[in-house]
Amino acid sequence: MAVTACQGLGFVVSLIGIAGIIAATCMDQWSTQDLYNNPVTAVFNYQGLWRSCVRESSGFTECRGYFTLLGLPAMLQAVRALMIVGIVLGAIGLLVSIFALKCIRIGSMEDSAKANMTLTSGIMFIVSGLCAIAGVSVFANMLVTNFWMSTANMYTGMGGMVQTVQTRYTFGAALFVGWVAGGLTLIGGVMMCIACRGLAPEETNYKAVSYHASGHSVAYKPGGFKASTGFGSNTKNKKIYDGGARTEDEVQSYPSKHDYV
């Protein structure tokens, strides 16, 4: 019962997490104009992975997609890739885990197969969560680097008569959604892995069989000779699962221009 609950909860948590990763990837507020210590502009800028937007104080919002692939910073491309990989792995993991759920009966699927699938989906969720967390963290690092570069620029080269509004960007809502969603997917994956251990049948003891020798009335239970003979129900249904090695690319921030309102 506890195993079913753990598996079910792991599935639900991962589902919420993956939905969050998808939402974060689609959101436009990955970086938003920093309003602190700046003049009150009548324009507010914010950017996502796929387009940048400008919201005027009049209420009008205009968004423009990044219609170039080669012209985009490598780090932005890396973040996009990490998020997409996270979504794809998460989606496959969800599909696998649906069939692995103990409460769902599919033909004559054995518990060992369900255990296998549960572990597979769990690993997929873990990697998916890590991809999302990595993607969001790379973007955040990029923002921090650019923020301080912009701040440095604000206090240099001000010798001229004409002032310019230096637009700086700070963390947008999508980053927090991404971190939380990645964390949830990761937790869900761990729960699935834990559930997998409980799903694998530990031992299948055969029922005792009585053998009657002529003239004697002694019942032999094969299980009793386990230690010495190796017969009986000593063989356990255990598998060694290889989670597979996972490597993550090292990432570094790229400087990006940002706007403010």
Epitope: V54, S57, S58, G59, F60, V165
Partner: antibody, heavy 118, light 113 residues
Framework: EVQLQQSGPELEKPGASVKISCKAS????????MNWVKQSNGKSLEWIGN????????TYNQKFKGKATLTVDKSSSTAYMQLKSLTSEDSAVYYC???????????WGQGTSVTVSS | DIVMTQSPSSLTVTAGEKVTMSCKSS????????????LTWYQQRPGQPPKLLIY???TRESGVPVRFTGSGSGTDFTLTISSVQAEDLAVYYC?????????FGTGTKLELK
């Protein structure tokens, strides 16, 4: 057709208050912010502030804070501006103007003349 | 506050003539987010409220004759009337639409000889 109909001219004594109105028609009143602009005799234009009819949120020019109060009545699609503690400096033509794309004032009322005299 | 400086303060022209007026802002009005300059031009005929002519420094409002052209970027802007007509006699104001408080220029008065 978008129209902004302002109330008639006002003659007030110093220290008094005046409330001028701007009735909007021909568009969704709550969909656009309303700006108020002051034009003193033959002089340039001064932005007073704006109000969002949907939320009632306001943004003021610091110079007019405490002098002007912006309100709206959604049911009648009317924006109001109240001017307090009037002085001769407040004698001017006041315009309401719809806030449009590009942070522009795309439609203007005909203006309300306020004269402060003892 | 952003100071908008217009020059000349008045212009006397003949019908059909090309006219250029300038507007300078004390801060850049260019928004890097969409690469648009938040500068607006208005026309105010005598006894009338101002009328929107050009926004984003160079985008003509619908219904505005093509003889009106806006140009410039950052802090320096220009309004050009390619062939002045009698109905163009008015005061022209430029406006900062980028940073609060929204501010207007002192105006350029266009008069006919």
């Amino acid at each position: 057709e978008v129209q902004l109909q302002q109330s008639g001219p006002e003659l007030e004594k110093p220290g008094a208050s005046v409330k001028i109105s701007c009735k909007a028609s021909g568009y969704s009143f709550t969909g656009y912010k309303m700006n108020w602009v002051k034009q003193s005799n033959g002089k340039s234009l001064e932005w007073i502030g704006n109000i969002d009819p949907y939320y009632g949120g306001t943004t003021y020019n610091q110079k007019f804070k405490g002098k002007a109060t912006l309100t709206v009545d959604k049911s009648s699609s009317t924006a109001y501006m109240q001017l307090k503690s009037l002085t001769s400096e407040d004698s001017a033509v006041y315009y309401c103007a719809r806030y449009g794309k590009g942070n522009t004032m795309d439609y203007w009322g005909q203006g309300t003349s306020v004269t402060v005299s003892s | 506050d952003i100071v908008m400086t217009q020059s000349p303060s008045s212009l006397t022209v003949t019908a059909g003539e090309k006219v250029t007026m300038s507007c300078k802002s004390s801060q850049s009005l260019l928004n890097s987010g969409n690469q648009k300059n938040y500068l607006t031009w208005y026309q105010q005929r005598p006894g009338q409220p101002p009328k929107l002519l050009i926004y984003w420094a160079s985008t003509r409002e619908s219904g505005v004759p093509v003889r009106f052209t806006g140009s410039g970027s950052g802090t320096d802007f220009t309004l050009t009337i390619s062939s002045v007509q009698a109905e163009d006699l008015a005061v022209y104001y430029c406006q900062n639409a980028y940073i609060y408080p929204l501010t207007f220029g002192t105006g350029t008065k266009l008069e006919l000889k």
